[in-house]
Structure formats: structure tokens, C-alpha cells
Amino acid sequence: SAHAHPRDSCPLGPGRCCHLETVQATLEDLGWSDWVLSPRQLQLSMCVGECPHLYRSANTHAQIKARLHGLQPDKVPAPCCVPSSYTPVVLMHRTDSGVSLQTYDDLVARGCHCA
Amino acid sequence: SAHAHPRDSCPLGPGRCCHLETVQATLEDLGWSDWVLSPRQLQLSMCVGECPHLYRSANTHAQIKARLHGLQPDKVPAPCCVPSSYTPVVLMHRTDSGVSLQTYDDLVARGCHCA
């Protein structure tokens, strides 16, 4: 097909385009100190940065969005940087019956793309 | 758990928050006129609008992102409005051997959320 391919080199300069970044957060930051017991400090990988034309396009829809944003910037937003996959996180937390270990699959980003 | 629940009422006023919107686009707009034969006009549903705190949060990660954006707006971006699901679209297009009908699963958004 004649679909444009997503590109991986950032035209805006190093660190400006959509990428994974680690943010330190305490349970207090998250408002979780009343139910999560461990870990007390979380390494939260998040997706940050801009999505210039066709950079790391998630799919065909994102490529269309990029194209139409170029034509109608007031009507169609640029694609934005969101998680493409997640890393499971184990939390030790309170339950009604005591304490439990539970794995959360949608808490920390592992990869990013432009959608 | 003490996770905040995503909310569905828009605090910014009607039509301002993340929602599905139909955008008309021609094959020329998309740069597809050399390979797509039909349809010649596409009704492209796209996700547009803002993502205020906890509005239509995609998952726990998005809730965390919203929280940390409130605390560190320069470091953590707000969640943004992206497709949560897609509607399949059938395109009639040229191939090396003639003409083909093909279904594209990731072309038109069906639902939106804040990720």
C-alpha cells in the first residue's frame, strides 16, 4: 500500500519527541498512602514528548490524524504520546481481610507511540 | 481499592471534553487517490477534546498521569484523547494484480478515552 511509514528519528532534536521517561513518585503524591504499603516509592515510567508528523505512528488512524492535522490544525489535533504497552507492577496493599500482593497490568508504561 | 474512578461528565462545558467527532476527508486529503478507488469520500471518526482531571481515564496509568500532572504540570503532561476502539472500514484499492477489497481495522475510531 501507499501508506506512509512511521518514522523513528526525531526532527525536533534529542529528547523532544515522544519517549518513555521515569518519574519518581511517593504514595503521598498518588494519594495511595492509605491503602498501598509497598513499594513506598514508585518508579513511574510515563510517555512524554511531542508527536511531529508521522513520528512513531501507532497505526493507520494516527497517520491519517497526522495528515489531517497538517491540513486542518484547528479542527484535528496532532497525535499525542501515549503508552503502547505496560509493565506489570506488584503492589502490597491493604484489603478488608489483611494484606495482599496484587499485580497491576496497566500502571506503568513500557513503550510509547503517537496515537 | 482507593483508586479514583474515571468521571464521565465534562466540567469544561458541552463538547469541550474528549469525544468522538466526524471529520470529512477526500482521498486527496489523505494522499490516497493513487491507490484507493472507493469510497472517494471518507467519514473519519476521530477523538478530539480535552482531558480534564480523571475524565474518561483509560486505566490506572491515566489516573496516575492526571494526578501527577496536577502536581508537576511542567514535567508530566495531561492525559490526552485517543481512540479506545476502532470501527473496521472496507476499502477498494489497486493491487499489483488488479483491484481488491480489504478491511482495515485501525482506520476509524469508534470510541475515545483519555490516556
Epitope: S33, L42, Q43, V90, L91, V99, L101 | -
Partner: antibody, heavy 119, light 112 residues
């Protein structure tokens, strides 16, 4: 069921670097909240926490060993490693790798490997 | 670093009888969330340590209910309601409130 297995030389010369690897099977090393940990036990003595590494690559070391310790992770091999430089006879110990929830709740341990520092 | 002190050093026990091990910390292990950040481990002869109790009083998965942990602040106790022959080994308490986690010197439990 998560299993951990230490590997590396059992004999290291004084002033050299002790290098051990822990291979994790039955689970991914790339999990948040999990700290992959090294603990040692001197012959006939108690346990000493050496340090740990989180999935993100963040490391935490015992201040008493910090200047000599490096812990790293290789997610592609599901392994994490310990390097202890400038060893002396006092570093002779059984070295264990373990999985912790942060720096507590060490629920899975390797079988331990004895490292002797001697010329 | 937090210093952990265990007593007794050695504990001869009779199968079927209860047993108790004490652990004292040099500073309070009680977190503002109301939990005590203390683990108990058992190292059986020739084996790696195994987790028994975490957060002061929570039994780890698969640990028999004859083991219980109690105490708060700086004074903690591990109790075995009815000792079995397989319970012999060295018991360690461990402070997990802050880095670095520190272990007690151990209590050796042996059959009389």
C-alpha cells in the same frame, strides 16, 4: 513459580572483582514494585543486605559497601548481576540473590553460592 | 542504620510445645500508615532463608498458621504455637522501615 539461580566463580583473588549473575526463571524480571536483591552471609554468621535493583534500573546499595558495589540488570536475558570490587578475605561469604517487594518481603531466594577470597 | 537485637541466641525446644523469639529494634519500625515494617525469616540447615512473616504480623504464602508475629514499635515476637521437628533452624528478624534493611543476629532453634 519464580526460581532464582546464582552463578559465578567460587574463588576470587584479593583486590580483584567478584562477579555473580542471578538468572530468574518462571517470571519476568521486568516487573515494577519488585527489587532484585543481593544478600550475603559470612560463614557461620548472620545475613547482610548488599543492595538491589528495580525494573527501571534504579539501584539501592548498603552504604557500608556502596563504594565497591555495582548491581545491573539484563532484561533480555532475565538476569541481574553483582560486582564487588577490591575484595578482601572479609568478603568471603555465601551470596544469595532474592526477589523483594521493594526492600522487604524476600519471598524467593536462590540456593546461594559460596565465594572464597583467597590468593 | 537500624540495629536489630534478637534473644535468645539459642532456643532448645520440645516438639508439641510452644516457642517464642524476641526481636528489638534501635528505633521504632511503626510507619505512619499504622504498619510495622518488620519481616521474619527461617533458615533451615543447609538451605536458603525463607519468608515467614512480613509487616510484623502477616503470614507469608504457604506458611503454617502455627507461626505468628506480634509487637509494635521496637519490640516484636515470633511465636510457634506447637513446635514441629521441621521448624529447626535459625530465625532472623529484619527491619524494612528504611534503607538499608538490617537483620538481627539470629536465634537458633533446636530440638532438646
Amino acid at each position: 513459580q519464580v526460581q532464582l539461580q546464582e552463578s559465578g566463580p567460587g574463588l576470587v583473588k584479593p583486590s580483584q572483582t567478584l562477579s555473580l549473575t542471578c538468572t530468574v526463571s518462571g517470571g519476568s524480571i521486568s516487573s515494577g514494585g519488585i527489587y532484585w536483591t543481593w544478600i550475603r552471609q559470612h560463614p557461620g554468621k548472620g545475613l547482610e543486605w548488599i543492595g538491589a535493583i528495580a525494573y527501571s534500573g534504579s539501584t539501592y546499595y548498603n552504604p557500608s559497601l556502596e563504594s565497591r558495589v555495582t548491581i545491573s540488570v539484563d532484561t533480555s536475558k532475565n538476569q541481574f548481576s553483582l560486582k564487588l570490587s577490591s575484595v578482601t578475605a572479609a568478603d568471603t561469604a555465601v551470596y544469595y540473590c532474592a526477589r523483594g517487594i521493594e526492600y522487604q518481603h524476600f519471598d524467593y531466594w536462590g540456593q546461594g553460592t559460596l565465594v572464597t577470597v583467597s590468593s | 542504620d537500624i540495629v536489630m537485637t534478637q534473644s535468645p541466641l539459642s532456643l532448645p525446644v520440645t516438639p508439641g510445645e510452644p516457642a517464642s523469639i524476641s526481636c528489638r529494634s534501635s528505633q521504632s519500625l511503626l510507619h505512619s500508615n499504622g504498619y510495622n515494617y518488620l519481616d521474619w525469616y527461617l533458615q533451615k540447615p543447609g538451605q536458603s532463608p525463607q519468608l515467614l512473616i512480613y509487616l510484623g504480623s502477616n503470614r507469608a504464602s504457604g506458611v503454617p498458621d502455627r507461626f505468628s508475629g506480634s509487637g509494635s514499635g521496637t519490640d516484636f515476637t515470633l511465636k510457634i504455637s506447637r513446635v514441629e521437628a521441621e521448624d529447626v533452624g535459625v530465625y532472623y528478624c529484619m527491619s524494612t522501615l528504611e534503607l538499608p534493611p538490617t537483620f538481627g543476629g539470629g536465634t537458633k532453634v533446636e530440638i532438646k
